[in-house]
């Protein structure tokens, strides 16, 4: 498919100009390259009529110009003096005229209206409003007034002062006569629709002494707006409708066949199944202006979009619209990255987010995608140094591996943490990810204690053990801060015998706190990684308190170490062995921590999209 | 919501130094940016300076920078405003601003030094530096 986008028809009247933009994908050797503007014939040539080499067909000498916009991906052509002969199919494109990296653009040229003398002119958009003004004489103010539609040959009333209103208007239309001081009146059609386009004559009086006034009604069709977004990237509809309809429903739908336009999402809450956890709506302004971003572009996303205004959030004859043409390019810059990733519960997942290399310096964030309200995606952690609370211990942000990717760490995964999260930087708009966690069936990879207590002064080694699938994996352990996890030395204490059907390649690596002080209080992980990318970690809280009684000392230690097979040693030395790996309660599946996630999260129950862009918790 | 209260304002000659706190309560586990604005009479709310809740970066107006310094105690859920070399021009009511995390995709592009950024405001304190 040519990555050549441009307005599929271009409507003018004969006199006018047109200016047509046609996007390519701003590579450097596109960017460089000739780009033209040519005929169709009947047999399939395309006759160059102007080129960004210079060239200019004597057809459009003095009338005609092409310029290229290389920063953009655009050139754009324009043409003057516009007569029914320039009707026809054109192509833009770039290179020769016969490669096929060109877009069809049909262009139309009709006959200026035929008026007569002294004909107001009303151009208006569909769905808008227009007032038609309408004078008369002193001797006929107490006259009847009345709007008259030319249909064919006979003038049809459409309404008039003694109450009448034409069915086809009903509930849209009204007469309004003005204060004795003005000798006018004025019709008010609300919801315009296209069928309303025509020759009215309004009327005082009905006899051979009335004043009479022509108008010619124009409804447009909102031209589209040509948007050029890559695949994998995001797009932005901003809809500004007015004022008049603030307080009225929204909607965002695309264009299927023929007239139907199916909702996308609107203000009641409504959202198209094939855009869950990618689509956000972001509330309208005091004067009814409303955006809604979509992002993870899909090449069945392109085509025709409206967005309006109407009390059932979806399109209705007279609904006021916007339009835009989406094309979205497969040659895109943004690379493949996972849209969904599966843990387990108790495990974790580790997500990479995509990001445009030219802005390393930018702050990234990951957010949870809120499909309640369609307008939210509330922080969760960013690359400045903040984590939500609800999320302290168990959620980091890496500028790893970098270089246009940066890593967000989840562990102690609930089924609460299954849902849709979007990576965003605060550079360029259009590079923003979703990705599904998926919470499986399964057990957490690495096995750690549950949460640990440390006596101040004395020495905790605690394990952390990793089955044989990691046996090429780089393992470590580090201690969790709001700004991320710094690495701590930690002793590779041989095999494990945590793991049933797992050889002498599975590891016991151990992390050794020398004389606990209070600093050493927190969240400490243990984990896996390949160079710069990472992979499952596991988290243990190390609390620290004060050396007890000798009397309560072994009871003590015992229950507040969930341990039960921890050995206190007499040099002050204590080990958790955790040989009883089996044991359930020595396992953080569900922490406190998770509990005290923020209620009004709410259950978020995961939507399958059947995405082949998958990935485990512990893969890359 | 959050609230935000100021002290340390006062009377002071120019050159001298001053040190205001903002203490906020509330739901503070919201907080994302912390900041200081200003205002002169007759003129607008002026940014001043602005702290990153979580790692600490900081923001300054040009106006300012090299003579304020903003610094916050998490602990305390403090932010603070040391002003050294203090100027006549520098007089004006200082407030105390606080950012929530952002939620709407909006949120994410605004930057903290614009006023439209901050979801609560104190009710701010008296700076006078005379000549």
């Known amino acids: 498919k040519s990555p050549i986008f441009g307005p599929e028809e271009v409507n003018s009247v004969e006199g006018n100009s047109v200016s047509i933009t046609c996007y390519y994908p701003p590579t450097s050797v596109n960017r460089h390259t000739r780009k033209y503007w040519c005929r169709q014939g009947a047999r399939g040539g395309c006759i160059t009529l102007i080129s960004s080499e210079g060239y200019v067909s004597s057809k459009y000498a003095g009338r005609a110009n092409l310029t290229n916009f290389p920063e953009n991906g655009t050139f754009v052509v324009n043409i003057a003096q516009l007569s029914q002969d320039d009707s026809g199919r054109y192509k833009c494109g770039l290179g020769i005229n016969s490669r096929g990296l060109s877009f069809d653009v049909s262009l139309e040229v009709s006959q200026g209206p035929g008026l007569l003398n002294d004909t107001k002119v009303y151009t208006v958009d569909l769905g808008r409003t227009v007032t038609i003004n309408c004078p008369f004489k002193t001797e006929n103010a107490q006259k009847r007034k009345s709007l008259y539609k030319q249909i064919g040959l006979y003038p049809v009333l459409v309404i008039d002062s003694s109450g009448y209103v034409n069915p086809n208007y009903t509930g849209r239309i009204r007469l309004d006569i003005q204060g004795t001081g003005q000798l006018l009146f004025s019709v008010v059609i609300n919801q315009l629709r296209l069928s309303d386009a025509g020759q009215y004559l309004c009327q005082a009086g009905d006899d051979s002494n009335s004043n009479k006034k022509n108008a010619d009604l124009q409804v447009l069709k909102p031209e589209p707006e040509l948007v050029y977004e890559d695949l994998r990237g995001s797009v932005t509809f901003h809809c500004a409708l007015g004022p008049e309809v603030a307080n009225v429903a929204k909607f965002l739908c695309r264009q299927s066949s023929g007239e139907n336009c199916d909702v996308v999402v609107n203000t009641l809450g409504k959202r198209a199944p094939a855009f869950e956890g990618r689509i956000l709506l972001n509330p309208q302004d005091k004067d009814g202006s409303f955006s809604v971003v979509i992002t993870g572009l899909r090449k069945e996303d392109a085509g025709r979009y409206l967005c309006g205004a109407h009390s059932d959030g979806q399109l209705q004859e007279g609904s006021p619209i916007q339009a835009w043409q989406l094309f979205v390019n497969e040659e895109s810059t943004i690379p493949r990255s996972p849209t969904v990733v599966k843990g387990v519960a108790g495990g974790s997942v580790a997500v990479l987010c995509p990001y445009n290399r030219k802005e390393s310096k930018s702050i990234k964030y990951w957010c949870l995608w809120e499909g309640a309200q369609n307008g939210r995606c509330p922080l969760l952690v960013d690359s400045e140094g903040w984590v939500k609370a609800q999320y302290e211990g168990r959620l980091s942000l890496l500028e790893e591996p970098g270089n246009g990717t940066f890593t967000v760490i989840l562990n102690q995964l609930t089924s609460r943490d299954a849902g849709f999260y979007w990576c965003l930087t605060n550079g360029d708009t259009l590079w923003r990810t979703t990705v599904e966690i998926k919470i499986i069936e399964g057990e957490p990879n690495l096995k750690v204690p549950g949460n640990v207590t440390a006596v101040l002064g004395e020495t905790l080694k605690v394990p952390c053990h990793f089955p044989c699938k990691f046996s090429s994996y780089e393992k470590y352990w580090c201690k969790w801060n709001n700004t991320g996890c710094q690495a701590l030395p930690s002793q590779d204490e041989g095999p494990s015998k945590a793991f049933v059907n797992c050889d002498e390649n599975s590891r016991l690596v151990s992390l050794t706190l020398n004389l606990v002080t209070r600093a050493d209080e927190g969240w400490y992980w243990c984990g896996v990684k390949q160079g710069h990318f990472y992979g499952e970690t596991a988290a243990v809280y190390v609390a620290v308190e004060e050396r007890k009684a000798a009397g309560s000392r072994d009871v003590s230690l015992a229950k507040a170490d969930a341990a039960p097979d921890e050995k206190v040693l007499d040099s002050g030395f204590r080990e958790i062995e955790n040989k009883a790996i089996q044991d359930p309660r020595l396992f953080a599946e569900e922490k406190a921590v998770a509990d005290t996630r923020d209620q009004a999260d709410g259950s978020r129950a995961s939507v399958d999209s059947g995405s082949s862009e998958e990935q485990g918790g512990s893969s890359r | 919501q959050v609230q935000l209260v100021e002290s340390g304002g006062g009377l002071v000659q120019a050159g001298d130094s001053l040190r205001l706190s903002c203490a906020a309560s509330?739901?503070?586990?919201?907080?994302?940016?912390m900041g200081w604005f200003r205002q002169a009479p007759g003129q607008e709310r002026e940014f001043v300076a602005a702290?990153?809740?979580?790692?600490?970066?900081?923001y300054y107006a040009d106006s300012v920078k090299g003579r304020f310094t903003i610094s916050r105690d998490n602990a305390k859920n403090t932010v603070y405003l040391q002003m050294n070399s203090l100027e006549p021009g520098d007089t004006a009511n200082y407030y105390c601003?606080?950012?929530?995390?952002?939620?709407?995709?909006?949120?994410?592009?605004?930057?903290?030094?614009?006023?439209?950024?901050?979801?609560?405001w104190g009710q701010g304190t008296q700076v006078t530096v005379s000549s």
């Open positions: 509330g739901r503070t586990s919201s907080l994302y940016n």
């Open positions: 601003a606080a950012r929530r995390a952002p939620e709407l995709l909006d949120d994410y592009k605004q930057k903290p030094e614009e006023i439209g950024a901050y979801h609560y």
């Open positions: 702290i990153h809740w979580g790692g600490g970066r900081t």
